[in-house]
């Protein structure tokens, strides 16, 4: 009984097209496999960014693979040949495991790449990225921002930078089509006459960095002797109902201050008859339904009822 | 005729464990690869885990990474699924299926009857 | 990870009707697809695998097609034992195995 061997892929190499984090992986099959033309050969393929503890496993039929990546670090890969046991008499075979790395060199000192980098989708429509001047660059340093995600044909220039003495320190993203719920990658390059500039890479998901507008309309409604029901009205734009959480926040007299967290437009309030004013203020955030992180609205506009009845059927400002 | 009967499902408390196991018979049980896939009450098929027909290589769904176990002992022609860390998400009938071709996961020619997980308080 | 979308997610039709099912695969997973057949309280039945070949014993009214990233399932001539759940599942990369979310088809 011969072992049975099987060669490691060919030629596997990291492409970067251009993605600025978003490569391909790519190999070809391995050499001499007319011992197994009746076989659906698969491959193992393990990476990771350099630092990272775990790798990504997956197994595929397919001569490539693409992924996201921080390109703020290096990348190594792997990738063995696997014959399933109807190939093999009965025994499963992998081949070695071929490899290979990926990096971008660097270009100046860390201190020169951006700073405090900051990025907000405001009502889930408009994105603006900020971001402060590396430490110790001088004047005439400048800061490029480039843009890419699936199903643009290649990355993007800002076309209107925020600028502050002279210098970009943001970007207004145009109207991004079909943008959310996948991969949105940024680089952020600099040139000056001085000395190269680090670039740096950012990579999120524009549903998890949604600030939405306030809450709209506040208005009471008198239930009962003892309870006052508080409305409001999601905030105009494109984020639906479902897709909300409120944070209320109620003072009773200037005294008591009651705070809570509601997935509905409205909040039952139990009060007693000696309450003389009720001022309210909501604001909103994006819920685990519609994406996996958010930022909380600013606070609406206080509305306050205040005099000698709060018994009245409804109570509107 | 080849036959899998899981066993090992009941009511557990959220953060609790359970171990299924999966009696295999009609076949030569060491050579396919093996997977659970489970389906919510009223909802779709959901693969969770695969592992080789040797037991070398086990894979697992992101949902259930780092909290369930898949092994084999083919000595006793019989999978397992050791899940640990329970949540009410996985309340679910948990089948076991046998993969028709492949390293580690493929069309599942075979599958057991179900066997239900309730995790709830 | 690949996602499967199936349509109709429920079908209404009669005995004696050809239906056809869909399966939509976000990239590419050549001919790497099966087709199950599940009933209410049973198991999934394998009808088909690598997009077209028919499992044993399943009736020769079911055929598969398609491969890339559009495929099909259809039954020829439905028959009363036909009424069931289908599920397309791609299984050319993984982890994760993932299916489709299901086409019921049910008595019009």
């Known amino acids: 009984d011969t072992e049975i061997k099987v060669n490691p892929p060919q030629d596997f190499e990291i492409v970067d097209p251009g993605y600025l984090g978003y490569l391909y992986l790519q190999w070809q099959p391995p050499l001499s496999l007319d011992h197994f033309k009746e076989c659906t050969v698969e491959y193992e393929l393990k990476y990771r960014n350099i630092g990272s503890e775990t790798w990504k496993t997956i197994i595929t039929k397919n001569l490539h693979y693409k992924d996201g990546f921080d390109l703020n670090k290096g990348i190594e890969a792997k990738i063995h040949t696997l014959l399933p046991w109807q190939c093999t008499n009965g025994s499963e075979v992998q081949s070695s495991w071929a490899e290979t790395t990926y990096w971008i060199s660097p270009q100046g000192i860390p201190e020169t790449k951006v700073q405090d980098m900051d990025c907000v989708y405001y009502n889930w429509q408009y994105l603006l990225c900020s971001w402060k001047p590396g430490i110790g660059v001088l004047l005439d340093t400048n800061y490029n921002l480039f843009y890419w995600y699936e199903g643009l044909d290649h990355a993007l220039q800002c076309v209107d930078y925020i600028k502050a003495d002279g210098q970009n320190i943001g970007c207004r993203f145009p109207y991004l089509e079909a943008s959310d719920y996948k991969d949105f990658y940024i680089c952020v390059n600099g040139s000056s006459e001085n000395k190269p500039i680090r670039s740096s890479y950012f990579t999120f998901q524009l549903q998890n960095i949604v600030k939405p507008l306030p809450p709209v309309y506040l208005t009471f409604t008198r239930e009962s002797s003892c309870e006052i029901k508080l409305k409001w009205s999601i905030p105009l734009g494109p984020i639906p109902a479902r897709c909300f959480d409120y944070e209320i926040e109620i003072r009773e007299d200037d005294t008591t201050l009651v705070t809570a967290t509601v997935e509905n437009e409205t909040y039952t309030l139990k009060t007693t008859n000696e309450t003389r004013q009720l001022c309210f203020v909501v604001r909103s955030k994006v819920n685990i339904y519609c994406s996996d992180d958010g930022i909380w609205s600013e606070w609406s506009d206080k509305q306050c009822w205040e005099g000698e009845d709060l018994s009245k059927k409804t109570l509107l400002r | 005729e080849v036959q899998l009967l899981e066993s090992g499902g009941g009511l557990v408390q959220p953060g609790g464990s359970l171990r299924l196991s999966c009696a295999a018979s009609g076949f030569t049980f060491k050579l396919p690869a093996m997977s659970w896939v489970r389906q919510a009450p009223g909802k779709g098929l959901e693969w969770v885990s695969a592992i080789t027909g040797s037991g070398g290589s086990t894979y697992y769904a992101d949902s259930v990474k780092g909290r369930f176990t898949i092994s084999r002992d083919n000595s006793k022609n019989t999978l397992y699924l050791q899940m640990n860390s329970l949540r009410a998400e996985d309340t679910a009938v948990y089948y076991c299926?046998?993969?028709?071709?492949?390293w580690g996961a493929g069309a599942f020619d075979y599958w057991g009857q179900g066997t239900l997980v309730t995790v709830s308080s | 990870d690949i996602q499967m979308t199936q349509s109709p997610s429920t079908l209404s039709a009669s005995v004696g009707d050809r239906v056809t099912i869909t399966c939509r695969a976000s990239?590419?997973?050549?001919?790497?697809l099966a087709w199950y057949q599940q009933k209410p309280g049973k198991a999934p039945k394998l009808l088909i695998y690598d997009a077209s070949s028919l499992e044993s014993g399943v009736p020769s009214r079911f055929s598969g097609s398609g491969s890339g990233t559009e495929f099909t399932l259809t039954i020829s001539s439905l028959q009363p034992d036909d009424f069931a759940t289908y599920y397309c599942?791609?299984?050319?990369?993984?982890?994760?195995?993932?299916f489709g979310q299901g086409t019921k088809v049910e008595i019009k």
């Open positions: 599942q791609q299984y050319d990369t993984y982890p994760p195995i993932t």
């Open positions: 990239q590419s997973i050549s001919s790497w």
């Open positions: 299926a046998k993969v028709r071709y492949g």
